[in-house]
Amino acid sequence: IWELKKDVYVVELDWYPDAPGEMVVLTCDTPEEDGITWTLDQSSEVLGSGKTLTIQVKEFGDAGQYTCHKGGEVLSHSLLLLHKKEDGIWSTDILKDQKEPKNKTFLRCEAKNYSGRFTCWWLTTISTDLTFSVKSSRGSSDPQGVTCGAATLSAERVRGDNKEYEYSVECQEDSACPAAEESLPIEVMVDAVHKLKYENYTSSFFIRDIIKPDPPKNLQLKPLKNSRQVEVSWEYPDTWSTPHSYFSLTFCVQVQGKSKREKKDRVFTDKTSATVICRKNASISVRAQDRYYSSSWSEWASVPCS
Amino acid sequence: RNLPVATPDPGMFPCLHHSQNLLRAVSNMLQKARQTLEFYPCTSEEIDHEDITKDKTSTVEACLPLELTKNESCLNSRETSFITNGSCLASRKTSFMMALCLSSIYEDLKMYQVEFKTMNAKLLMDPKRQIFLDQNMLAVIDELMQALNFNSETVPQKSSLEEPDFYKTKIKLCILLHAFRIRAVTIDRVMSYLNAS
């Protein structure tokens, strides 16, 4: 058993039918010695008397808010949450496995640049009685500071019969140098509590591996005289690290017909312009990627050919 | 401690091409190592990230773009003095700071070259003959070093008398390749910046 925060305790349980459970001793936070009784949640049934209460915790019915009283007056509370260990593996019932880029990916994180700022998000089908708290650091043995905001509900979507809720959090490394070569990963830790169930999720990454630039901006077409060709031009996104000659991007230019089945023409360039053939009803899209370290491509920026 | 913006004329920068080749070569070699050593801990998540140049060179700091010198987090106080007769920039405008930067890159390459050659000698003794260093990568390191053209003492190739532990050697190869790829990215960024300046 360990303390999550004041008066909230987590009991770690080997979780299988008929498991023996854990013996827990609760102590009433009071100078009083006698006349103390204990109750659980809203029930008035007295579970025991005395300054300490010993309970065998085996299932969720044994968790909840234990209160010690004296003569009708509340002395203190202890909220017991359960952390299930199924076959030696901590349970992951609260968050959905996003399965990208691999199974057991519960947290996903992205950074728009090398400033040390990043966003993480996760999914759940649970809509109520749910709280999250997020901590982060650079490295774990001698951790360096990363400050995270509060997790907020960022999207809701319907998936089949279920509603899916997306939560996200923004974090900023306290002293980040965009040019630094990372040798210690960023660690992100999310505590999740649903009713009386506690779970924790972690992700470990280097900023360089989660880079996803914003799409190129000011995408423009300039028709070339007496030709079906156009000059496409664009600019680096505002959010990308500077100087651009040091933090260079490479680009992919795509001409896509109206029908998804039509052949796509693609050109790769390090410049911020390209000459392509504009077909009727087609659109031109451009996306960006770090030129030297192949992390994710940005989303496409698009303009119609017409 | 940083790169001045006023640097040589465009097209006077032969190192950019070599640095791009270097990054391509090390990335290919790392990919090959990951595939060949699939049952070894060779992914970025599995390895310890070690930098063999730590406390010996200060490439990131010495090659910091001018725009980042205002960022206090970038200004570590590691100073190293280097020989300053680099010819990569073929220009008298080459400042002391730039020479320090290029000299630091040269020292990095020399250190990795020695490590890779020592490691290759061990891998050649492996009866499994599972993996060897790509000769192209070693050649590209050499070409960039020649383009940088610094005079420095040659570091003797390490030789060890004890029987090599091939498992450990292959894990060390993965660690080295990961670190060298990161350094190659920095070198490429620096060369691109200098070329544009």
């Epitope: 299988y16 039918p17 030696g88 349970s91 992951t92 019932d93 609260i94 | 801990p41």
Partner: antibody, heavy 112, light 107 residues
Framework: EVKLVESGGGLVQPGGSRKLSCAAS????????MVWVRQAPGKGLEWVAS????????YYADTVKGRFTISRDDPNNTLFLQMRSLRSEDTAMYYC?????WGQGTTLTVSS | DIVMTQSQKFMSTSVGDRVSVTCKAS??????VAWYQQKPGQSPKGLIY???HRYSGVPDRFAGSGSGTDFTLTISNVQSEDLAEYFC?????????FGGGTKLELK
């Protein structure tokens, strides 16, 4: 006493469908992840699918992905395995399990 | 996929003996390994989880050990009711995979 009782097996033609059920008792079913495992005649054990408590996470073996669907009905303490596009190689004894307990199994035969 | 190899398909033993059933994973699975017992004509039953933890009610003559890629189920003081097939299983990553089984027979 913990009990898992499978039902729904039988003879099915190739390409056909079948839904297996597993009735659980003796434990708080909704609080536990569950799995389906199968065993072809005279062969070893093969994991088929898993479902977490609350159905938030579901995983399938590649051999059944897209054809089988695992689901649960917590109020009725029942686990299901909906099987479609059945093949002869799906012939096996199907067990539902929540370690260390396994049901007695239900036999599915896919044959024309 | 992780392959779990039980190299011995059959093992002969006598009542009162100590026997060790081995299992090898094709890659590191930490301690995320379980052992099952299946008696002829019956369904399997879980014995060990996390490589070395016994489920409650499992006799203490059953002991699991190992981590990484090499795992062992040891039955000390074999009883006649222990004559069965034993399967190892990894649950470190999906798909979950079982060993091919080792049948324990009387000499």
């Amino acid at each position: 006493e913990v009990k898992l009782v499978e039902s729904g097996g039988g003879l099915v033609q190739p390409g056909g469908s079948r839904k297996l059920s597993c009735a659980a008792s003796g434990f708080t079913f909704s609080d536990y992840g569950m799995v389906w495992v199968r065993q072809a005649p005279g062969k070893g054990l093969e994991w088929v699918a898993s479902i977490s408590s609350g159905s938030s996470n579901i995983y399938y073996a590649d051999t059944v992905k897209g054809r089988f669907t695992i689901s649960r009905d917590d109020p009725n303490n029942t686990l299901f395995l909906q099987m479609r596009s059945l093949r002869s190689e799906d012939t096996a004894m199907y067990y539902c399990a929540r370690n260390p307990y396994w049901g007695q199994g239900t036999t599915l035969t896919v044959s024309s | 996929d992780i392959v779990m190899t039980q190299s011995q398909k059959f093992m002969s033993t006598s009542v009162g003996d100590r026997v060790s059933v081995t299992c090898k994973a094709s890659q590191n699975v930490g301690t995320n390994v379980a052992w099952y017992q299946q008696k002829p004509g019956q369904s399997p039953k879980g014995l060990i989880y996390s490589a070395s933890h016994r489920y409650s009610g499992v006799p203490d003559r059953f002991a699991g050990s190992g981590s990484g890629t090499d795992f062992t189920l040891t039955i000390s003081n074999v009883q006649s009711e222990d004559l069965a097939e034993y399967f190892c299983q990894q649950y470190n990553s999906y798909p979950l995979t079982f060993g091919g089984g080792t049948k324990l027979e009387l000499k």
